[in-house]
């Protein structure tokens, strides 16, 4: 084997130049170095072929495999992948080597497997086999985002756990309330790890990979705002770390902060402060409480003080396991057909939800607010007015809760009819739910009010469809009735609606629908 | 064999929107892009962006953010794109196409839906 | 966005000539060497069909008389000889960047 070449086979991993949503852009940037995937002799295999250890992708991400050749003279070269083949175009790096490379942008399961790349060289040919999968997506994780103080500097660092490794962004805002929404013009995003501007409003950390996105919300006491009616709560897990931000503007810096827990001064290496003159020289004050891994006994109640401000509080809970609280009853509700109505679930939880509402099987996205007492709630008002059984279903890391509500529509009945030779049958579903009656359509009684009371037999509610009941009404066939049309009738408190129907007609034949309100 | 079925023509009034789908058969979706391209007499080949089926992940030319957007349905292997809030700029023939093996060449297109925006 | 500049933007070749298309990118559409450059061909009523993928790979089921050729930024399609089946609008495309590009077409007569 002293002819053999000496190979080097390397993977680059694209870095992603586009910070968009969900994007991948399919040109590198910058690179990460080269990773070497050996590229060893296989054994036991016909001709001289080379392995490189197996390279796992995630998907949309893009890679190049590159193979360089310490061979004298020209080499040429063909990628071969399932059945495909690609032209190769060898070059020389600086070293003198032969470079070939194979780019596989924007990866998808289909661009797994085996790429194989013949090489022929004025001294021999062989072949390099690159194994290519994906990543297994089920060990992906996204991890809320959590605060650290960098060293040596009166900044923060947002890190979030997650794999494939998130993008991290910071969403600032200045404004108060509802103007502080994530689209809305006051909002500004900055996509990098740390942040020095810490005096904002709203200050909120966001990680974002395959998975989703989950933001962190930087907890806030601003002693120029009127206290909230309860007291605000911030709940932690123990091992978490504890940041709570305290603000103050004063017309001057004659005035200082100070944090205490249940009226014990925090211990010095648990806070740390800044300050800034604002636009019309006034001077702001920030002052952080911190713990980088709370204990039960951090528990209490955490009071901002300033020599120019009243104090105010927070309570901080700190719990073994997360919980969703909310009242798991169900609920039923009877609406017109044109009422405007929402389903609500009120609820306390840490950490925060991921939630659905699903109604036929079909999910929709669930927004959740936070309420000033320290509840928050869910709305869902997309219905369109179709009744049934709907379901909110929330989890977080240690918790799940299911609440069911059914929705009744208020409607006069609605007749659907079907016959056989056997018998005749008549379907509603109407709110409530109808009562039924037949009539028999003859000489004696051609405005068919001749009632049929032998061989009716009802069904209330004899079917759920996604929660909405349906009532059917059925006539069983006697020589009495058979050849002559006969009508069934529905009617609930919102009016009648009729079918009529020949007997002992070939399959189903609803003949008239009337309406009767 | 792998083929792209798309959605009849639509006449849509300003101001609309209108989803158009493209069905593939002979091949599962969830694993490829599908992309999607604009054709206007006179203005050639636009690509307006594109999405992974089985990840939900898609990327959309930055000119017709807000305006396209994609989904898909694995279980029917259907791609789709929703156009909003049209005006007679948006009157043209969309196509959808799968890349190839080797990423970025289009080797199957749909025969294209003609939308045409008029009051 | 690179902006794709094909020349000429119509052509007229006689039967069993060659006919050459140029396709010029604004900036680099290779990486590592890779060209990310395609070619398709469009006739009326019916959606583009690709050529060539990556600068010079022939896709399969087209015939050998269609070529690709260039890297980085100058590339050209080459039909030799020209048949009277090929009267139709040739573009290439790029997809080494995001947003991908075409070029504005050339139109390919038989004279």
């Known amino acids: 084997n002293q002819d053999l070449p000496v190979i080097k086979c390397v993977l680059i991993n694209h870095k992603n130049n586009d910070s968009s949503v969900g994007k991948s852009s399919s040109y590198p940037m910058v690179s990460e170095s080269p990773e070497d995937l050996g590229c060893a002799l296989r054994p036991q295999s016909s001709g001289t072929v080379y392995e490189a250890a197996a390279v796992e992708v995630d998907v949309s991400a893009s890679i190049t495999l590159q193979v360089l050749v310490d061979a004298p003279g020209n080499i040429s070269c063909l990628w071969v992948f399932k059945h495909s083949s690609l032209n190769c175009q060898p070059h020389f790096d600086l070293q003198n080597r032969g470079v070939v490379s194979m780019v596989i942008l924007k990866m998808t399961e289909t661009q797994a497997g085996e790429y194989l790349l013949f090489i022929q060289s004025e001294a021999t040919n062989y072949t390099i086999l690159f194994t290519v999968s994906i990543r297994n997506t089920l060990l992906y994780t996204l991890r809320r985002p959590y605060f650290r103080k960098m060293e040596n500097q009166d900044a923060l660092v947002c890190i979030s756990e997650s794999v494939p490794e998130p993008i991290v962004e910071w969403v600032l805002c200045d404004s108060q309330g509802e103007s502080c929404k994530e689209e809305s013009p006051a909002v500004v995003k900055k996509e990098e790890k740390v942040l020095h501007e810490l005096f904002g409003t709203d200050i909120r950390c966001c990680a974002r990979n395959e998975l989703g996105r989950e933001c962190t919300r930087l907890f806030t006491i601003d002693l120029n705002q009127t206290p909230q009616t309860t007291l605000p709560q911030l709940f932690l897990k123990v091992g978490e770390p504890l940041w709570i931000r305290c603000k103050a503007v004063h017309v001057n810096h004659g005035f200082g902060l100070t944090w205490e827990l249940e009226n014990k001064a925090l211990e010095e290496g648990n806070y740390f402060e800044m300050s800034t003159y604002s636009t019309n020289r006034t001077m702001i004050r920030i002052l952080f409480a911190f713990v980088s891994s709370v204990a039960r006994n951090d528990t209490g109640y955490y009071t901002c003080s300033s020599s120019k401000h009243p104090s105010q509080s927070a309570l901080v809970t700190i719990v073994e396991k997360g919980f969703i609280n909310a009242t798991n009853s169900s609920e039923d509700y009877e609406i017109d057909q044109y009422e405007e109505f929402c389903f609500s679930v009120r609820f306390k939880a840490y950490p925060q939800i991921r939630c659905t509402w699903t109604f036929s099987r079909k999910s929709f996205p669930c927004e959740q607010k936070g309420l000033d007492n320290g509840y928050s709630i869910s709305k869902f008002c997309n219905h369109k007015h179709q009744p049934g059984e709907y379901i909110f279903h929330a989890e977080n890391d240690d918790a799940q809760f299911t609440k069911m509500f059914t929705l009744n529509i208020r409607r006069k009945p609605q007749v659907l009819a079907e016959a056989s030779a056997s018998q005749a049958s008549c379907f509603s579903d109407g709110y409530p739910l109808p009562s039924w009656t037949w009539k028999k359509c003859s000489d004696k009684s051609p405005n068919c009010t001749e009632e049929i009371t032998e061989g009716v037999w009802n069904r209330k509610a004899n079917r759920k469809v996604f929660g909405q009941w349906v009532s059917s009404s059925t006539l069983n066939m006697s020589e009495a009735i058979k050849g002559f049309l006969v009508k069934c009738c529905a009617y609930n408190s919102l009016g009648t609606s009729c079918e009529t129907i020949l007997l002992n007609s070939p399959g189903p034949f609803p003949f008239i629908q009337d309406n009767i309100s | 064999q792998v083929q792209l079925q798309q959605s009849g023509a639509e006449l849509m009034k300003p101001g609309a929107s209108v989803k158009i789908s493209c069905k593939a058969t002979?091949?599962?979706?969830?694993?490829?892009?599908i992309e999607w391209i604009k054709q206007r007499p006179g203005h050639g080949l636009e690509w307006i962006g594109e999405?992974?089926?089985?990840?939900?992940?898609?990327n959309n030319n930055e000119k017709f953010k807000g305006k396209a957007s994609f989904t898909a349905d694995t279980s029917s292997n259907t791609a789709y794109i929703q156009l909003s809030s049209l005006t007679s700029e948006d009157s043209a023939v969309y196509y959808c196409?799968?890349?190839?093996?080797?990423?970025?060449?289009?080797?199957?297109w749909g025969q294209g839906t003609s939308v045409t925006v008029s009051s | 966005d690179i902006v794709l500049t094909q020349s000429p933007a119509s052509l007229a070749v006689s039967l069993g000539q060659r006919a050459t298309i140029s396709c010029r990118a604004s900036?680099?559409?290779?990486?590592?060497?890779?060209?990310?450059m395609h070619w398709y061909q469009q006739k009326p009523g019916q959606p583009p069909k690709l050529l060539i993928y990556?600068?010079?790979n022939l896709e399969s089921g087209i015939p050998a008389r269609f070529s690709g050729s260039g890297s980085r930024t100058d590339f050209t399609l080459t039909i030799n000889p020209v048949e009277a089946d090929d009267v139709a609008t040739y573009y290439c495309?790029?997809?080494?960047?995001?947003?991908?590009?075409f070029g504005g077409g050339t139109k390919l007569e038989i004279k």
């Open positions: 196409a799968r890349p190839n093996l080797f990423g970025g060449a289009m080797d199957y």
């Open positions: 002979g091949y599962t979706i969830s694993s490829n892009w």
């Open positions: 999405i992974l089926p089985g990840s939900g992940r898609a």
């Open positions: 900036e680099s559409v290779d990486t590592y060497g890779n060209s990310f």
């Open positions: 990556r600068a010079s």
């Open positions: 495309q790029q997809s080494n960047k995001d947003p991908w590009t």
